[in-house]
């Protein structure tokens, strides 16, 4: 018989069986070869094995698929459609597999996937519909709460002739389908800008992960609706200062944690609303760790130890008094 | 589900110590502000003071009228507050909850617990 | 410190009738946009529930017939309609500043 997973620890398939069992259906039970398999624990991994493709023969019983460290390079429409389907299947992890392009539908027929982690993949080709799995205006509600989507920017030769931005932001959007997700991670993406449309429809976000991006500003960015957001990661950007609008939004979400370490801020004449409003808010995490970089006589200083005489503009000059 | 059950009150005689205990269950201690809030019988509510979070160094506040003799504290491996209450007064003779502040501790305390009784006496 | 008076002291209601309840602050509660005004109600014998938070938001499984209003420096608490589960003493809170001040409460009791 074909070896299964026994109840207490993993099982391990014997590679040359692979080829005995492909052509007959899969057993329920079976373990795919490369994997191993807890049946007790309800989990497949099938981890850095170079594996090119997922296994048919996942066992009908899998809650949590671990396929990371792999060469999958394209996650084509129903990757995982199964007959029967994997009903079970709450989370799946598909970091570190070197995928490039995920297709629309590549998620399709799982019907209680909850947590998807596609981090540290280069993915040049995201589909707008790979979450969605379906063109039309309003989707299907896809039954995520939890996408995390850490350092997925592909090398920039690598990368479409167009915003890797919008082409993520896309994928979030389409079709409304995640309205219900909770936690959404987008670190080290370098990431620019925030369309200013995509909080707006995640209204049930708990946790929203931006740090180690490029963004400069959030000026455009509202967090008004975002009312159950519990934690705002925002470390390690390139943000110079927060404006009054922001801070109101930030200062009245009522479950909200945020965290600003590392940015570059300037401490100039623009920054007095924000130095005020860091005195007396408690929602900034670690808000004595803030400092300047700029100007240069700033560097360093403590944003909370700074007063109004400490930021000030240097005079826009006449033309007639600048120097060449 | 949010749990906050308070322990340690009892009579106590005026000039010693007492030290209260709140056991915290059913969210991430660390993520959360902590207060304590008094109540003398038959009065309103008086707020004692609060701990802050992790990400904000577990720092205090106190009201005035205990300052320098009330100190409130942590274990966040148990998820237990505490409130060290020495040189006791008469008029410290309360109600002590335990209350959680909400996430953005702007907003105050979402949960509170059932509240245990210091009789400060001679 | 701000100091929170509220009005009245003692409020005798009838089931099915509308109530009000007044909190004046001795300095405005607002701050960035958000006025950090609560309202809670203390049963007989129970510790106090959050009822309001942020001046107009009803906390989660509250019922809707209370309502919040106000800003800055004048706040007001509506019950639509009386039930007999209402009664009780009824808090505001200011979290704009420490210390954290509460209103002396209201008494709600059926006539």
């Known amino acids: 018989s074909s070896p299964t997973s026994s109840a207490s620890s993993f099982s391990s398939s014997a590679p040359f069986l692979a080829s005995a069992v492909s052509a007959q259906p899969p057993l329920p039970d079976q373990c795919p070869a490369l994997c191993e398999c807890s049946e007790a624990a309800r989990t497949v991994k099938c981890v850095n094995r170079n594996l090119t493709e997922v296994p048919t023969d996942l066992p009908a019983y899998v809650r949590n698929l671990f396929l990371t460290g792999n060469q999958l390079a394209v996650l084509p429409a129903g990757a995982f459609a199964r007959r029967p389907p994997l009903a079970e299947l709450a989370a799946l992890n598909l970091s570190g597999s070197r995928l490039d392009e995920v297709r629309a539908g590549a998620f399709e027929h799982l019907p209680s996937l909850r947590q998807l982690d596609l981090s540290h993949n280069p993915l040049a080709d995201l589909s707008p519909f790979a979450f969605s799995g379906s063109n039309a205006s309003v989707s299907a509600p896809s039954p995520l709460v939890e996408l995390i989507l850490n350092h997925i920017v592909p090398p920039e030769d690598e990368r479409q002739n167009r915003s890797f931005e919008g082409m993520v932001v896309a994928a979030l959007l389409a079709g409304r389908a995640l309205q219900g997700l909770r936690r959404l991670e987008l670190a080290s993406n370098h990431f620019l800008y925030l369309p200013r449309d995509v909080l707006a429809q995640l209204p049930s976000l708990r946790h929203l992960d931006l740090s180690n991006n490029s963004l400069v500003s959030l000026t455009y960015v509202s967090f008004r609706n975002l009312t159950h957001l519990e934690s705002l990661h925002l470390e390690d950007n390139a943000l110079k200062v927060l404006h009054n609008g922001t801070l109101a939004e930030l200062q009245g979400l009522p479950h909200i944690r945020v965290f600003l370490d590392n940015n570059p801020w300037v401490c100039d004449c623009h920054m007095a609303d924000m130095v005020t409003w860091l005195k007396e808010t408690e929602v900034v995490q670690g808000k004595d760790r803030l400092t300047c970089a700029y100007p240069e006589k700033m560097r360093n200083r403590v944003l909370l130890e700074l007063n109004s005489a400490d930021l000030d503009c240097d005079p826009i000059l006449p033309p007639s008094l600048q120097t060449s | 589900e949010v749990q906050l059950v308070e322990s340690g009150g009892g009579l106590v005689q005026p000039g010693r110590s007492l030290r209260l205990s709140c056991t915290a269950s059913g969210f991430t201690f660390t993520d959360y502000y902590m207060s304590w809030v008094r109540q003398a019988p038959g009065k309103g509510l008086e707020w004692v003071g609060f701990i802050r979070n992790k990400g904000n160094g577990y720092t205090t506040e106190n009201s005035a009228s205990v300052k320098g003799r009330f100190t409130i504290s942590r274990d966040n491996s148990k998820s237990i507050l505490y409130l060290q209450m020495n040189s006791l007064k008469t008029e410290d003779t309360a109600v002590y909850y335990c209350?959680?502040?909400?996430?953005?501790?702007?907003?105050?305390?979402?949960?509170w617990g059932q509240g245990t009784l210091v009789t400060v006496s001679s | 410190d701000i100091v929170l008076t509220q009005s009245p002291l003692s409020l005798p209601v009838t089931p099915g009738e509308p109530a009000s309840i007044s909190c004046r602050a001795s300095?405005?509660?607002?701050?960035?946009?958000?006025?950090?005004l609560q309202w809670y109600l203390q049963k007989p014998g129970q510790s106090p529930q959050l009822l309001i938070y942020?001046?107009?938001n009803v906390e989660s499984g509250v019922p809707d017939r209370f309502s919040g209003s106000g800003s800055g420096t004048d706040f007001t608490l509506k019950i639509s309609r009386v039930e007999a589960e209402d009664i009780g003493v009824y808090f505001c809170?200011?979290?704009?500043?420490?210390?954290?001040?509460f209103g002396g409460g209201t008494k709600v009791e059926i006539k």
């Open positions: 300095e405005s509660v607002e701050f960035y946009g958000t006025s950090f």
């Open positions: 942020g001046a107009s």
């Open positions: 209350a959680r502040y909400r996430g953005n501790p702007h907003y105050a305390m979402d949960y």
């Open positions: 809170q200011q979290s704009r500043k420490v210390p954290s001040t």
